[in-house]
């Protein structure tokens, strides 16, 4: 039932869950100088009754006595920004988000945890989309993923969002409606739905990968 | 709390207009696309148009000539304006937001406003 | 546009009940969310990604299906789930509800 894959990336974006189906893993990692402790648990495990949902294990860090051997690479904050976003997580949970039954919430920061959070999704886990500061979203529907069991393999659906720089946005109108553009879809069928956006997607679906094809540079 | 209260519904001759608002609280609209849904009387539910947190839009095919949909972030406060409204644009037009961010699966609903087009 | 059909239309139960209802969709969409309303209420969310449960709603209430077919499934009828239900997709643009299944008691 674990996502065989990562969510899909999406250039310029980063992805949330806001809640955790059970079965989740979270990877306990330390930042640099700290490790787990010993006999420490290696992931904490999203578990629950039919009533509440919890997170099993604990994560704790400790400083490391020996130095580390291994070669790590901490990219700095612009690296960052452009970095592969599937499984970073940021910890903190929107207020408003109403509890869901079979989740969990975020799990609270545990002291010297490591910049990013690895998780491991299960079947049926949904994650939402955003751009990054400074890039403006465009969209042919809703900016999520939803992990799924296709013929005995795992899937993520691809979110039906592009992140585009402030300096393209004069290529989308998102002031007036356009004549009805033709449009992809993420099950490669015809779509009828009118974006202001004014773009055109095509999808490979052999890949399950899309490819955006601008109507004002390629047409 | 997230709450959604529509307003602005009420009688309109064919071929007038109005203005809907939502006014939300409880979450920034600048983290949510907010949607318009519809339901004429005795119908099953239509969709209408979302507005994303970006500000990008989506409409019904059938409708977008005569819909268009915005928000003010600042006022909390989203819009849909309706014109050359025709007899069948008769029904309860509901705000709702999704679980979360620009999602599909809408968590939120406000209570309705009745929008009755006659002559 | 994808059509959802919703069926039974209506259907008459007895409370404990185990009642399905089915949506079929005209094309393949990646999962559906089923939502139950009450006369002069507004939609309450029910499942959301085919089988996971909104918030408060019981676990007598269950989803499956994948394709073009979906199941919304109550396990034991009580008297509140005296409703109709609405599947809906955004798979694929634009987004579309069923026609909804009316749930009467016998």
């Known amino acids: 039932e674990l996502c065989d894959d990562d969510p899909p990336e999406i250039p310029h974006a980063t992805f949330k869950a806001m809640a955790y189906k059970e079965g989740t893993m979270l990877n306990c990692e330390c930042k640099r100088g700290f490790r787990r402790i010993k006999s420490g648990s290696l992931y904490m495990l999203c578990t629950g009754n039919s009533s509440h949902s919890s997170w099993d294990n604990q994560c704790q860090c400790t400083s490391s006595a020996t130095r580390n051997t291994t070669k790590q690479v901490t990219p700095q904050p612009e690296e960052q920004k452009e970095r592969k976003t599937t499984e970073m997580q940021s910890p903190m949970q929107p207020v408003d988000q109403a509890s869901l039954p079979g989740h969990c919430r975020e799990p609270p920061p545990w002291e010297n945890e490591a910049t990013e959070r690895i998780y491991h999704f299960v079947v049926g886990q949904m994650v939402y989309y955003q751009c990054v500061q400074g890039y403006r979203a465009l969209h042919r529907g809703p900016a999520e993923s939803v992990c799924k069991m296709t013929h005995g393999k795992t899937r993520w659906t691809q979110p039906q969002l592009i992140c585009t720089g402030e300096m393209e946005t004069s290529q989308f109108p998102g002031e007036e409606k356009p004549q009805a553009s033709p449009e992809g879809r993420p099950e490669s069928e015809t779509s009828c739905l009118v974006t202001t956006t004014d773009f055109q997607i095509q999808t490979e679906m052999a890949a399950t990968m899309e490819t955006s094809i601008f109507t004002t540079e390629y047409q | 709390q997230v709450q959604l209260v529509e307003s602005g519904g009420g009688v309109v001759q064919p071929g007038g207009s109005l203005r809907l608002s939502c006014a939300v609280s409880?979450?920034?609209?600048?983290?949510?696309?907010i949607q318009w849904v519809r339901q004429a009387p005795g119908k099953g539910l239509e969709w209408v148009s979302v507005?994303?947190?970006?500000?990008?839009?989506n409409y019904n095919s059938a409708l977008m000539s005569r819909f268009t949909i915005s928000k003010d972030n600042s006022k909390s406060t989203l819009y849909l304006q309706m014109n050359s409204l025709r007899a069948e644009d008769t029904a309860v037009y509901y705000c709702?937001?999704?679980?979360?961010?620009?999602?599909?699966?809408?968590?939120?609903w406000g209570q309705g406003t009745l929008v009755t087009v006659s002559s | 546009d994808i059509q959802m059909t919703q069926s039974p239309s209506s259907l008459s139960a007895s409370v404990g009940d185990r009642v399905t209802i089915t949506c079929r969709a005209s094309?393949?969409?990646?999962?559906m969310h089923w939502y139950q309303q009450k006369p002069g209420k507004a939609p309450k969310p029910l499942i959301f990604a085919t089988s996971n449960l909104a918030s408060g709603v019981p676990s007598r209430f269950s989803g499956s299906g994948s394709g073009t077919d979906y199941t919304l499934t109550i396990s034991s009828l009580q008297p509140e789930d005296f409703a109709t239900y609405y599947c809906?997709?955004?798979?694929?643009?634009?987004?579309?509800f069923g026609g909804g299944t009316k749930l009467e008691i016998k």
């Open positions: 709702a937001r999704a679980y979360g961010y620009d999602g599909s699966w809408l968590a939120y």
């Open positions: 507005i994303w947190a970006g500000g990008s839009t």
């Open positions: 094309s393949s969409v990646s999962y």
């Open positions: 809906q997709q955004w798979s694929s643009n634009p987004p579309t």
């Open positions: 409880g979450f920034s609209l600048t983290s949510y696309g």
